[in-house]
């Protein structure tokens, strides 16, 4: 049973980047907390040129953006996976 369970682990990020992305070039961000089939938190950024990059959750600049998003969404109940457009 355990073997079957672990074959269903699904992380989308193979490689993570800490490279800074200016907010004006970010289209949207998807944050997937641990669980949901993946044992680690994943942050996926869509750039304005439609390319996608997985960002290291420890990168200081993405933590700032996430904090900003948290503040903006503090009035709504939390959801396990959420996408935010960057204004």
């Amino acid at each position: 049973v355990l073997e079957v369970y672990y074959t269903h682990l699904r992380c989308r990020c193979v490689q993570e980047s800490s490279v800074f992305i200016p907010r004006r070039f970010i289209d949207r961000i998807q944050i997937s907390p641990r669980g949901n089939g993946c044992p680690r938190k994943e942050i996926i950024v869509w750039k304005k040129n439609k390319s996608v990059v997985c960002v290291d959750p420890q990168a200081e600049w993405i933590q700032r953006i996430m904090e900003m998003l948290r503040k903006k969404s503090s009035s709504t109940p939390p959801v396990p996976v959420f996408k935010r457009k960057i204004p």
């Epitope: 800490s18 490279v19 800074f20 200016p22 004006r24 070039f25 040129n49 990168a59 700032r64």
Partner: antibody, heavy 119, light 107 residues
């Protein structure tokens, strides 16, 4: 090989206008923002603005919004910068530079166009 | 606008020496900083992006660090061909802004 080829030096009179060109080759021109940078003889670099050739969207440094106009011609993979109402303060070398989508600094630069404003 | 200040306009060094150039931002720019090298008569060339990441093909004697407002660019063992002006640039917020440049002179 990515190359940005800029037009030649310009000697213009005060009050006149000038149009500098930057022809790109070796990459998909529409996919990358083009930046323009001024380098005065004092050597400081100043960002004038950028243009997205995909939709002609521009972002200007407020300092240059009444001085410069950025345009592109996708058919010839060429970016242009118009400078108007020229004064001696506008005498400088002007560079076009491509923005990298990988790391967002300017990864390829033209050779520069010298503009001299003198009567 | 964010002001980038390079406190030294000139730095004199000898071949083989270690040299560090500093750059201070007038407000927090996170890791949105690049370093450029401009050799005499040439266009600027990017060496470092995202405060500490070396661009492809840049020798490993060039390193950089920093976050927030204070940034440092280091050449661990200066070579004769490193004679150039070095600029920091922030790309945290538009307008992108550059430091005034530090000219590295070889004794």
């Amino acid at each position: 090989e990515v190359q940005l080829q800029q037009s030649g030096p310009e000697l213009v009179k005060p009050g006149a206008s000038v149009k500098i060109s930057c022809q790109a080759s070796g990459y998909a021109f529409s996919d990358y923002y083009m930046n323009w940078v001024k380098q005065s003889h004092g050597k400081r670099l100043e960002w004038i603005g950028d243009i997205n050739p995909n939709n002609d969207g521009t972002t200007y440094n407020q300092k240059f919004k009444d001085k410069a106009t950025l345009t592109v011609d996708k058919s010839s993979s060429t970016a242009y910068m118009d400078l108007r109402s020229l004064t001696s303060e506008d005498s400088a070398v002007y560079y076009c530079a491509r923005l990298s989508w990988s790391f967002f600094a300017m990864d390829y630069w033209g050779q520069g166009t010298s503009v001299t404003v003198s009567s | 606008d964010i002001v980038m200040t390079q406190s030294h306009k000139f730095m004199s060094t000898s071949v083989g020496d270690r040299v560090s150039i500093t750059c201070k931002a007038s407000q927090d720019v996170s890791s949105g900083v690049a370093w450029y090298q401009q050799k005499p008569g040439q266009s600027p060339k990017v060496l470092i992006y995202s405060a500490s990441h070396r661009h492809t093909g840049v020798p490993d004697r060039f390193t950089a660090s920093g976050s927030g407002t204070d940034f440092t660019f280091t050449i661990s063992s200066v070579q004769a061909e490193d004679l150039a002006v070095y600029y920091c640039q922030q790309y945290y917020n538009t307008p992108w802004t550059f430091g005034g440049g530090t000219k590295l002179e070889i004794k």
